[in-house]
């Protein structure tokens, strides 16, 4: 079960979806993507304290063991829980074509 959404570290410090603007050059895509020329990349960024947005029992255990053995067990990571699809117009060997990527943009985030 996904646990609490209250962030003990203060606003915007805990795991959440954030939008980062990136050019094709920033992403290293300029040689194969034609459009969009700038991507609003939704990413999962932030800390995963206590039981914040724990994705499952494994994440809860990880949090507990991290408190006990921080040198051995890493804290849970903020990762996408689901994705929004996005279409790219790309160059291929046979010409320009469309390709939809189902896992390019984070929709919402959790800790795992």
């Amino acid at each position: 079960a996904r646990n609490g959404d209250h962030c003990p570290l203060g606003p915007a410090a805990c795991c959440a979806a954030h939008t980062v603007r990136a050019s094709l050059e920033d992403l290293g895509w300029a040689d194969w993507v034609l459009s969009p020329r700038e991507v609003q990349v939704t990413m999962c960024i932030g800390a995963c304290p206590s039981q914040f947005r724990a994705a499952n029992m494994h994440a809860q255990i990880k949090t507990s063991l991290h408190r006990l053995k921080p040198d051995t067990v890493p804290a849970p990571c903020c990762v996408p829980a689901s994705y929004n699809p996005m279409v790219l117009i790309q160059k291929t060997d046979t010409g320009v074509s469309l390709q939809t990527y189902d896992d390019l943009l984070a929709k919402d985030c959790h800790c795992i």
């Epitope: 034609l34 459009s35 969009p36 929004n84 699809p85 996005m86 279409v87 790219l88 117009i89 320009v96 469309l98 939809t100 943009l105």
Partner: antibody, heavy 117, light 106 residues
């Protein structure tokens, strides 16, 4: 495989409202960068862009016709709707809908002929 | 709005001939698309963003240009190229098409 199909009344009278439906398959308007555009073509003449509706419900209209155009979508049923109010004989044309990916009319419907008479 | 003027309005070409269709914009645009429309069918894209061939389009088609002047070249015209050709800009709304060039084969 992407397909689009336009449907409309065929014939209607001046001053009425033209209602067009674009039914599509093979893509989703939940996909970022995806939209549906409307273009019309009077017989024997060139193409005129009318409007686009996007995945995020942004709508853009041809400024010359904006006051008469209304766009909407039903994402779950893969349909887009265009209404043109107060039609006259100058609106007689074949109306196309097309899949728009960012800036590209990638796939087009076969078109539906609308006659104002 | 940006007005696109295509010339010539009608072009007649012989099989195997190289031809160039032009599109002039009333103000500068970043890129141009080119569409082909054969009689009784819907348009299809030939050139994406000035010079990129769309998937499945024969290599005899090519595009170039910048600013206010763009062109579409067919290096060796074939009978199946008889069609109307439209340039299209999306640099600013409203998106606009050129008036078209009708290519006839002698």
């Amino acid at each position: 495989q992407v397909t689009l199909k336009e449907s409309g009344p065929g014939i209607l009278q001046p001053s009425q409202t033209l209602s067009l439906t674009c039914s599509f398959s093979g893509f989703s308007l939940n996909t970022h960068g995806m939209g549906v555009g409307w273009i019309r073509q009077p017989s024997g003449k060139g193409l005129e862009w009318l409007a686009n509706i996007w995945w995020n419900d942004d709508k853009y209209y041809n400024s010359a016709l904006k006051s008469r155009l209304t766009l909407s979508k039903d994402t779950s049923n893969n349909q887009v709707f265009l209404k043109i109010s107060s039609v006259d004989t100058a609106d007689t044309a074949t109306y196309f809908c097309a899949q728009v990916a960012w800036d590209w009319f990638a796939y087009w419907g076969q078109g539906t002929l609308v006659t104002i008479s | 709005q940006i007005v696109l003027t295509q010339s010539p309005a009608i072009m007649s070409a012989s099989l195997g001939e190289e031809i160039t269709l032009t599109c002039s914009a009333s103000s500068s645009v970043r890129y141009m698309h080119w569409y082909q429309q054969k009689s009784g069918t819907s348009p299809k894209v030939l050139i994406y963003s000035t010079s990129n061939l769309a998937s499945g389009v024969p290599s005899r088609f090519s595009g170039s240009g910048s600013g206010t002047f763009y062109s579409l070249t067919i290096s060796s015209v074939e009978a199946e190229d008889a069609a109307d050709y439209y340039c299209h800009q999306w640099s600013s709304y409203p998106w606009t098409f050129g008036g078209g060039t009708k290519l006839e084969i002698k």
